[in-house]
C-alpha cells in the first residue's frame, strides 16, 4: 500500500524520449493527445508536475516483514489530468480524475543507465510506458531481458521553478 | 534480518586484478538495485558502480569505468565487482549497498556491508 | 557531474547542543539527497532520505530539510551517541556523489 496520500516530494520537469525527442500534450476535441514529437528550437517544452510517492515492498523471504520501498510516481501535465495506463487497449491516456488517483495512474520508478527512468505500471508488473509510432504506449518487457531497451528509457529535466501547476 | 557481507579484499599489485563478492540474505535480492561504494583510507566516500535488479542496467563513476565491471547472481543472491588494471588509487575499503528503493536510487542507500579492504601497492 | 559541498567540514558540540549541517549541489538535484552518519570502522548508516524523509528506526531528533541546491541536516540535541562524521550524498543522477563530511567532535 501507499505510504499516507500525500507525496514525498514533487517536481516539474519536461519529459523526452531516449533519442531527446518531447513528450508534448494537445488538446484536441475537448480530450488530451499525447505526442512524441521533435520540437522545433523556439518552441517552449511541455512541463508535468511528477508526484513521487513511496510504497512499502513486503519481503517474501521473511513473510510478513517489509524489505524497502517501491518509489511510485503519478505524472500530470495540466491541472486535474494524470497519465493513466490502459492495460486492455496497451495504451496511455490522460483522463481527468480526482483524489485518491485510480491504480492506473500510478507508476514505479527505474532508473536506469544514461541518467535514463522507466515507468512500469502499478497495475501490471513487466509493462512500462514505451514509445510506439510517435505515440506513448504500454509495452511489455520480459524482466530476464536488458530492460534498458530504448523505446522504455526517458529523460527528465527537472524545471527549477516552484512546483505548481501551469495552465 | 539483512545482512550484506563482502569478500575478495587484499593486497594486489598495480595492474593486477580482484573480483569482490558481496552475499546478500533477509530481503528479496533480486527486487534491488545493488551498489558498490569505496572509501580510501582517512577520506570520504565514493559511488563505484550500481547494478539494477535484474541485471540489465549498469552505472559507473568514470574513475573505474573500462576497469571494473559490476554483475550479479540471483539465483545464488550475490553481487560481483570485477576489479581489473588496478591502481594505487583504488585502495579503499569496498562497501556492499542495497538501495532503500526496489528499483531506484534516488532514496539512497539503507543497508551497508562491513566492507573489504583492497590495497593497490608493489 | 554533481558536485556536492558540506560545511562546516568539523563542529565541536557539547551534549545538548542543537547542531546543523549544510550540504550545497552544484546543480538542482529536486529532493533526492541523502545524509549518513559514519563511526570510524563502521559502516555509513542511512538516517534521512528524500531531502527530510527520517528513516526508519532513526531517532527524531535528525531531522532534514532544503531542496533544488540548498540542504541541512540538523541534531535538534546532540547526543553522546551521535559524534561521528556525517555524509550528504546526491541520488538525482549518475554518478551518484557525496559531500566531503562534517566531523562531529566533542566540545
Known amino acids: 500500500s501507499i505510504t499516507g496520500i500525500s507525496p514525498i516530494t514533487e517536481s516539474l520537469a519536461s519529459l523526452s524520449t531516449y533519442n531527446d525527442q518531447s513528450i508534448t500534450f494537445a488538446l484536441e476535441d475537448e480530450s488530451y493527445e499525447i505526442y512524441v514529437e521533435d520540437l522545433k528550437k523556439d518552441k517552449k517544452k511541455d512541463k508535468v508536475l511528477l508526484s513521487y510517492y513511496e510504497s512499502q515492498h513486503p519481503s517474501s523471504e521473511s513473510g510478513d516483514g517489509v524489505d524497502g520501498k517501491m518509489l511510485m510516481v503519478t505524472l500530470s501535465p495540466t491541472k486535474d489530468f494524470w497519465l493513466q495506463a490502459n492495460n486492455k487497449e496497451h495504451s496511455v491516456e490522460l483522463h481527468k480524475c480526482e483524489k485518491p488517483l485510480p491504480d492506473q495512474a500510478f507508476f514505479v520508478l527505474h532508473n536506469r543507465s544514461f541518467n535514463c527512468v522507466s515507468f512500469e505500471c502499478k497495475t501490471d508488473p513487466g509493462v512500462f510506458i514505451g514509445v510506439k509510432d510517435n505515440h506513448l504506449a504500454l509495452i511489455k518487457v520480459d524482466y530476464s531481458e536488458n530492460l534498458g531497451s530504448e523505446n522504455i528509457l526517458f529523460k527528465l529535466s527537472e524545471i527549477l521553478e516552484h512546483h505548481h501547476h501551469h495552465h | 534480518e539483512v545482512q550484506l557481507v563482502e569478500s575478495g579484499g587484499g593486497l594486489v599489485q598495480p595492474g593486477g586484478s580482484l573480483r569482490l563478492s558481496c552475499a546478500a540474505s533477509g530481503f528479496t535480492f533480486s527486487s534491488y538495485v545493488m551498489s558498490w561504494v569505496r572509501q580510501a583510507p582517512g577520506k570520504g566516500l565514493e559511488w563505484v558502480s550500481s547494478?539494477?535488479?535484474?541485471?540489465?542496467?549498469?552505472n559507473y563513476a568514470d574513475s573505474v569505468k573500462g576497469r571494473f565491471t559490476i554483475s550479479r547472481d540471483n539465483s545464488k543472491n550475490t553481487l560481483f565487482l570485477e576489479m581489473n588494471s588496478l591502481r594505487a588509487e583504488d585502495t579503499a575499503v569496498y562497501y556492499c549497498?542495497?538501495?532503500?528503493?526496489?528499483?531506484?536510487?534516488?532514496?539512497?542507500?539503507?543497508?551497508w556491508g562491513q566492507g573489504t579492504l583492497v590495497t593497490v601497492s608493489s | 557531474d554533481i558536485q556536492m559541498t558540506q560545511s562546516p567540514s568539523s563542529v565541536s558540540a557539547s551534549v545538548g547542543d542543537r547542531v546543523t549541517i549544510t550540504c550545497r549541489a552544484s546543480q538542482g538535484i529536486s529532493s533526492w539527497l541523502a545524509w549518513y552518519q559514519q563511526k570510524p570502522g563502521k559502516a555509513p548508516k542511512l538516517l534521512i532520505y528524500?531531502?527530510?524523509s527520517l528513516q526508519s528506526g532513526v531517532p527524531s531528533r535528525f531531522s532534514g530539510s532544503g531542496s533544488g541546491t540548498y540542504f541541512t541536516l540538523t541534531i535538534s540535541s546532540l547526543q553522546p551517541e551521535d559524534f561521528a562524521t556525517y555524509y550528504c550524498q546526491q541520488a538525482n543522477s549518475f554518478p551518484l556523489t557525496f559531500g566531503g563530511g562534517t566531523k562531529v567532535e566533542i566540545k
Open positions: 528524500a531531502a527530510s
Open positions: 549497498a542495497k538501495s532503500l528503493g526496489t528499483t531506484t536510487t534516488f532514496l539512497g542507500f539503507d543497508y
Open positions: 547494478i539494477s535488479g535484474n541485471g540489465g542496467s549498469t
